[in-house]
Interface confidence: low
């Protein structure tokens, strides 16, 4: 049986529950290696309150559909009168990175996951050339995740102190100049994820080959190397490489640009000093809300939520929105889609897509911008569901009783961009953590 | 000390029973997978059962249907019930306890011979 999703078998992959201390080591394809959970385990599940290790899904007992793998074991659930066995269900949804699968819930019998990933997609529109794992658990398995900084079209400029050269890079995948055939990149080799270019030439230093490491807490490392042979002649007879260290902050600030720590013989060393680097729940909330000790920062959205039926209208040229965030009133457009943003065709008003879902939100405020994410909506011909990203603004003298009101800035890839100002955005920070 | 010690062995005609018993020390029992594995005379060690500590079982195709593992954590024990005994079952049974943080523990064996 051929694997269902290649580009995911090079890796064994992990997801948690943090509520019962359980790590999950997937590998979709093969074996996951662990002498604890047998030889052909492609599912284990490792119980670090008891310290047990058991295997939830025999790579063996493998059965896939497009969007969904199971994994069977032999193993009875010990439920009376049943003979129901120890099962994993990965549910796959297309997205625009590798993505990580995520651990939804687990009944005595089965353990669910949920992964959005360009594998899943129907086209192969948002699949990288080479891209590796982007997140990583530390040991308090709190889950360090550098997606969001994946571009799927450009690079980052490395800060750099050379007039002559300058470096690109991306982060876990490789640059696409053919989405975004920006002057100096477009002369970057295919499969690189970090350019020099010098003059009119551009020379491939690095490519993705392992996943996201961390090697403390809030450091974690990429490296990148030059995959093909033939040294290119400034190197000094040296394979170029590149190393990327991602720095969480000791406090709240805004966002850096990735910065040339050291070179040389094509050895690079970069840091880049960003919020994305944290842990996950230090900067996301599936609330309105964000505060706490963990967070040490106050945002409070939920008075922007809409009552009595009514919502906010953004003007979209083609299409008309209609948001109710933070809350889970229905859209009277939305037809009972559930969904926070709705999508309406002016020329034909029955044509109603949504374009994010209520119960799937994430509130984001990291490197100084806070956003509102909701996902989950009508699918598009890719397979990727819509989704609504919200940038908000902090605006102390917005109208609307310090509400203000989303601007549709634009949709790329059925992502759809609003810009909000509102006094609500105004950030209260608390001391460091 | 940590240690397993394995009891219950004997001589049994075919389709007798049997029971097994793994008696634990010096370990968190409960933590622990447990599983039983035979050898027979001339022959590789086999894997017979599991039991995780969450209580799920799983069992070798030859024995599926026959043989039951079962645990009792006040006694710090774990127990392999052996019906419709065949002389191909005949061998030693070691009991193994499987835990992330020390090296896998075994028992020194117990024989069982099926035989008329």
């Known amino acids: 049986q051929a694997a269902p999703f290649p580009e995911l078998c090079s890796y064994t992959w992990e997801a948690v529950d943090t509520k019962n201390n359980v790590l999950y080591k997937i590998n979709i394809c093969g074996s996951v290696d662990i002498v604890q959970c047998g030889p052909s385990s492609a599912v284990c599940m490792h119980d670090l309150k008891t310290r047990t290790y058991h295997s939830v899904g025999d790579s063996v007992l493998r059965s896939a559909t497009r969007s969904l793998l199971e994994f069977n074991t032999t193993v009875s659930c010990d439920q009376q009168g049943t003979n129901h066995r120890v099962q994993s269900s990965i549910a796959f949804l297309c997205g625009k990175t590798l993505g990580t699968p995520e651990f939804v819930t687990a009944t005595f019998c089965v353990h669910y996951f949920e992964w959005r990933t360009t594998a899943a997609c129907k086209k192969d529109i948002f699949k990288a050339n080479k891209e590796v794992p982007c997140y990583v658990f530390d040991e308090e398995l709190r889950k360090h995740d550098l997606n969001p900084l994946i571009k799927l079209s450009g690079a980052y400029l490395v800060d750099d102190s050379d007039p002559d050269t300058s470096l690109f890079i991306n982060v876990c995948r490789d640059i696409d100049t053919l989405r975004d055939p920006g002057s100096q990149l477009r002369a970057c080799p295919p499969g690189t994820a970090a350019c020099l270019v010098r003059g009119h030439q551009a020379f491939d230093v690095g490519q993705p080959r392992d996943g996201l490491k961390v090697v403390r807490k809030d450091r974690l490392v990429l490296s990148y190397v030059r995959e093909e042979a033939g040294k290119l002649d400034f190197c000094d007879g040296h394979s170029p490489a590149v190393t990327i260290t991602f720095v969480c902050p000791s406090e709240r600030r805004e966002g850096t640009i990735p910065k040339l720590t050291a070179k040389s013989n094509c050895r690079y060393e970069i840091e880049w000093i960003t919020e994305y680097a944290c842990h996950r729940d230090y900067l996301e909330s599936k609330t309105c809300s964000l505060s706490g000790e963990q967070q040490d920062v106050s945002i409070d959205l939920t008075p922007l939520a809409q009552s009595g039926g009514s919502s906010y209208i953004s003007d979209g040229k083609e299409y008309l929105f209609y948001l109710n965030v933070c809350g889970e009133t229905e859209i009277q457009f939305c037809n009972k889609k559930q969904a926070a943003v709705c999508q309406v065709k002016k020329s034909d008003t029955s044509q109603v897509k949504a374009a994010g879902r209520y119960h799937n939100q994430t509130l984001r405020y990291s490197d100084g911008d806070l956003t509102l994410i909701y996902f989950g909506g009508d699918e598009c011909s890719s397979g990727f569901q819509r989704m609504s990203v919200i940038n908000f603004e902090c605006n102390k003298t917005a109208g609307n009783d310090g509400k203000g009101t989303p601007v549709f800035t634009g949709e790329v890839d059925c992502t759809y961009f609003f810009t909000w100002d509102t006094e609500y955005a105004c950030v209260h920070h608390h001391h460091h953590h | 000390d940590v240690q397993l010690v394995e009891s219950g062995g004997g001589l049994v005609q075919p389709g007798g029973s049997l029971r097994l018993s793994c008696a634990a020390s010096g370990i968190i029992f409960s933590d622990n997978r447990m599983d039983w594995y035979r050898q027979a005379p001339g022959k590789q060690r086999e894997w017979v059962a599991t039991?995780?500590?969450?209580?799920?079982?799983t069992y070798a195709d030859s024995v599926k249907g026959r043989f039951t593992i079962s645990r009792d954590n006040a006694k710090n024990t774990v127990y392999l019930q052996m019906n419709s005994l065949r002389p191909e079952d005949t061998a030693v049974y070691y009991c193994?306890?499987?835990?992330?943080?020390?090296?896998?523990?075994w028992g020194q064996g117990t024989l069982v011979t099926v035989s008329s």
């Open positions: 193994k306890a499987s835990s992330p943080v020390l090296n896998d523990i």
């Open positions: 039991l995780a500590s969450y209580g799920w079982k």
